[in-house]
Amino acid sequence: APVPPGEDSKDVAAPHRQPLTSSERIDKQIRYILDGISALRKETCNKSNMCESSKEALAENNLNLPKMAEKDGCFQSGFNEETCLVKIITGLLEFEVYLEYLQNRFESSEEQARAVQMSTKVLIQFLQKKAKNLDAITTPDPTTNASLLTKLQAQNQWLQDMTTHLILRSFKEFLQSSLRALRQM
């Protein structure tokens, strides 16, 4: 697995470099996670033909994956920094159970899946420091998450492959939309 942001040889070799601002650190963290997702998607796509399915076809699923909507304040029309930040953090917290599901779904990229999960936890911490209105952030119920995880793991092989693909694609889209909005803050 690649080393987390801030721990690569370039950073070590350049101690005179200005420390990253909070926004730069978040930006770098999200790009690091996106790289991880890209590696995981490669393995998934090599293993099955899920990646050939159209986005429309894949949208027809019963997974309740977090998604950005107009009302969340993360798009240019109706942009609202605080509302958007709450949505980003809430969405990432909701994705955690799905990232847990991914942990035993990869053979050659097992470490990468763990890195994506751990880096997302770090990202949530970074963002929580940035948010002023932490009270508005709802944490998913652990019992609900546990039963969802059991249900996902009980699916047949084809559905598990489909679920893996959908999680990766949705998480990628959510992070892209999040970073687009964060770059405006």
């Epitope: 999200i30 996106l34 240019q76 889209e173 892209q176 939309s177 970073l179 687009r180 770059r183």
Partner: nanobody
Framework: EVQLVESGGGLVQPGGSLQLSCTTS????????VGWFRQAPGKEREFVAD????????WYAHSVKGRFTISRDDAKNTVYLEMDGLKPEDTAVYYC?????????????????WGQGTQVTVSS
């Protein structure tokens, strides 16, 4: 990195329209975010508009909002900038840029590939 080629620039009268295109022959262009920037003589290069990997997610500079429209046709590996109600102050070289992370944004540093630019002149 992808090779980007802009086209569609030219001379147009104030109030007129132009459609710029940004095309690549590279694979996976549908996974890139694409931004348009412009540079007028003696001025800094500035952000105009961008479109994420998700085509619904667009962003515009205040100076062009409501007049310019960015869109993408992934089947043709092309991103368009539809420019209506052109003003003399829109005169510049227009560049398209791509971000492999599919994110984009309003700063040049967010992009890893750039085209050579196409000249747009608005004058009567």
């Amino acid at each position: 990195e992808v090779q980007l080629v802009e086209s569609g620039g030219g001379l147009v009268q104030p109030g007129g329209s132009l459609q710029l295109s940004c095309t690549t022959s590279g694979r996976h262009f549908d996974e890139y975010a694409v931004g348009w920037f412009r540079q007028a003589p003696g001025k800094e290069r500035e952000f105009v508009a961008d479109i994420g990997e998700n085509a619904d997610n667009t962003w515009y500079a205040h100076s062009v909002k409501g007049r310019f429209t960015i869109s993408r046709d992934d089947a043709k590996n092309t991103v368009y900038l539809e420019m209506d109600g052109l003003k003399p102050e829109d005169t510049a070289v227009y560049y398209c840029a791509a971000d492999k992370y599919g994110v984009g944004g309003n700063a040049q540093g967010y992009y890893d590939s750039w085209g050579q630019g196409t000249q747009v002149t608005v004058s009567s």
